[in-house]
């Protein structure tokens, strides 16, 4: 791939290894700054899948407050608003990053970690099984 | 609430305002351990809201990969395989913690910063606007 | 002194509109998710809308969705919420409030409360 | 949607007495429940959160517990300012939901 020369201007580091230890400016820069707020704040009630949002909190963790997602039904709402078993509701997860403060209750000291949250659900057809 | 006392073993830091510059451990610990990746890796094809995922890359990010969803069709699949324009595919958005590389291309020192990612797609019933 | 101070209330007249504003002082805003609440004359605490931190996504009690409108202003420390095609039964005392901030939980769920600002549905 | 119900409505009891209020969920909410107090004309007050933790400067003759989804909040050493309507607030799932309300009286 494409070699990126370092900037002089980086801080010093003595230790190149990986797993290694960085600055992070925690002062969050936020990408989504046309987001409408609307867009999807109510899919989870008018999807076929529908899901309720549940309370995770951490206090030792950035993000400290996560809101996950749990399908309401195992089946799908049909167009008369009713369950249907014939398909399935299923959680969207993804893989996200948060800080987790390492060693504990320290404010300056942190660690990556990796954890899978729920979205939101999503319709699927179900995988069927045929007995020969 | 609860004051839980600083950790004796802390790093020092002089800084003790917000933002403030910290020392982040990049060796990740992965907190899904149990979890079946085959699990969901086909609701994209199999969802009624199906999506494709497209590759977003930024070698001065960390996660430099991110797979985006992108809702295949406006409607949704109905029962006989059909797109049904009555029903909505509508990406379910998460926003997600990354490391952006500050001053850029330095390999120790990075900022915080919040993206919004599409993870998939599900199906809505539309929103409709009465004229009067 | 850490506080949230309502405004923006005042008479409307049935199927009319009225825009409440939420100023934050004493801390950071934007790590905190917030929430409006209301309470009818003599009646109890009815919740109403919650906004994310950002602002990137909210949702609504049933008795207001498609009317309100929450959103928020980090630059500015400022929560809003937009009430549209107002009703006899919106008639109440709108409280804002922060829940836990996501720095991690520097503080304690829906600590701070502010004094209310008062929305009268009248013809 | 989850049902929190406050019991008592209404509570008579004395300078000195202590007294325990009562919030039942229709559904688990793990121990996302908070307690507020609210007197005649003024806004909420925060007493407790995550079901049994003290908020700040509230004195500790306030205290909550849990039993699956029972939540109750104890007040000891009843003093006149105690005297004031208490709400619970669940807030593990949207949409948020207060208790009714449990109006405390001097007898």
């Known amino acids: 791939g494409i070699t990126i020369p370092r900037n002089p201007g980086c801080p010093n580091s003595e230790d190149k290894n990986f797993p290694r230890t960085v600055m992070v400016n925690l002062n969050i820069h936020n990408r989504n700054t046309n987001t409408n707020p609307k867009r999807s704040s109510d899919y989870y009630n008018r999807s076929t899948s529908p899901w309720n949002l549940h309370r995770n909190e951490d206090p030792e963790r950035y993000p400290s407050v996560i809101w996950e997602a749990k399908c309401r039904h195992l089946g799908c709402i049909n167009a008369d608003g009713n369950v249907d078993y014939h398909m399935n509701s299923v959680p969207i997860q993804q893989e996200i990053l948060v800080l987790r403060r390492e060693p504990p209750h320290c404010p300056n000291s942190f660690r990556l970690e990796k954890i899978l949250v729920s979205v939101g659900c999503t319709c699927v057809t179900p995988i069927v099984h045929h007995v020969a | 609430g609860i004051t839980i006392p600083r950790n004796p073993g802390c790093p020092n830091s002089e800084d003790k305002n917000f933002p403030r510059t910290v020392m982040v451990n990049l060796n990740i610990h992965n907190r899904n351990t149990n979890t079946n990746p085959k699990r969901s890796s086909d609701y994209y094809n199999r969802s009624t809201s199906p999506w494709n995922l497209h590759r977003n890359e930024d070698p001065e990010r960390y996660p430099s990969v991110i797979w985006e969803a992108k809702c295949r069709h406006l409607g949704c699949i109905n029962a006989d395989g059909n797109v049904d324009y009555h029903m909505n595919s509508v990406p379910i958005q998460q926003e997600i913690l990354v490391l952006r590389r500050e001053p850029p291309h330095c390999p120790n020192s990075f900022r915080l910063e919040k993206i919004l990612v599409s993870v998939g797609c599900t199906c809505v019933t539309p929103i409709v606007h009465h004229v009067a | 002194e850490v506080q949230l101070l309502e405004s923006g209330g005042g008479l409307v007249q049935p199927g009319g509109s009225l825009r409440l504003s939420c100023a934050a002082s004493?801390?950071?805003?934007?790590?905190?998710?917030m929430m409006w609440v209301r309470q009818a004359p003599g009646k109890g605490l009815e919740w109403v809308s919650y906004?994310?931190?950002?602002?990137?996504?909210?949702t609504y009690a049933d008795s207001v969705k498609g009317r309100f409108t929450i959103s928020r202003d980090n630059s500015k420390n400022t929560l809003y919420l937009q009430m549209n095609s107002l009703r006899a039964e919106d008639t109440a005392m709108y409280y804002c409030?922060?829940?836990?901030?996501?720095?991690?939980?520097?503080?304690?769920?829906?600590?701070?409360w502010g004094q209310g600002t008062m929305v009268t549905v009248s013809s | 949607e989850i049902v929190m119900t406050q019991s008592p409505s209404s509570l008579s009891a004395s300078v000195g007495d202590t007294v325990t209020i009562t919030c039942r969920a229709s559904?688990?909410?793990?121990?996302?429940l908070a307690w507020f107090q609210q007197k005649p004309g003024k806004a909420p007050k925060s007493l407790i959160y995550?079901?049994?933790n003290l908020q700040s400067g509230v004195p500790s003759k306030f205290s909550g517990s849990r039993s699956g989804t029972d939540f109750t909040l104890t007040i000891s050493s009843l003093q006149p300012e105690d005297f004031a309507t208490y709400y619970c607030?669940?807030?593990?799932?949207?949409?948020?939901?207060f208790g009714g309300g449990t109006k405390l009286e001097i007898k």
């Open positions: 409030a922060r829940d836990t901030s996501l720095w991690f939980g520097d503080n304690d769920a829906f600590d701070i």
């Open positions: 004493g801390f950071t805003f934007s790590p905190y998710s």
């Open positions: 906004i994310y931190s950002s602002g990137g996504w909210t």
């Open positions: 559904h688990d909410i793990n121990t996302y």
């Open positions: 995550a079901a049994s």
């Open positions: 607030l669940q807030y593990d799932t949207f949409p948020l939901t």
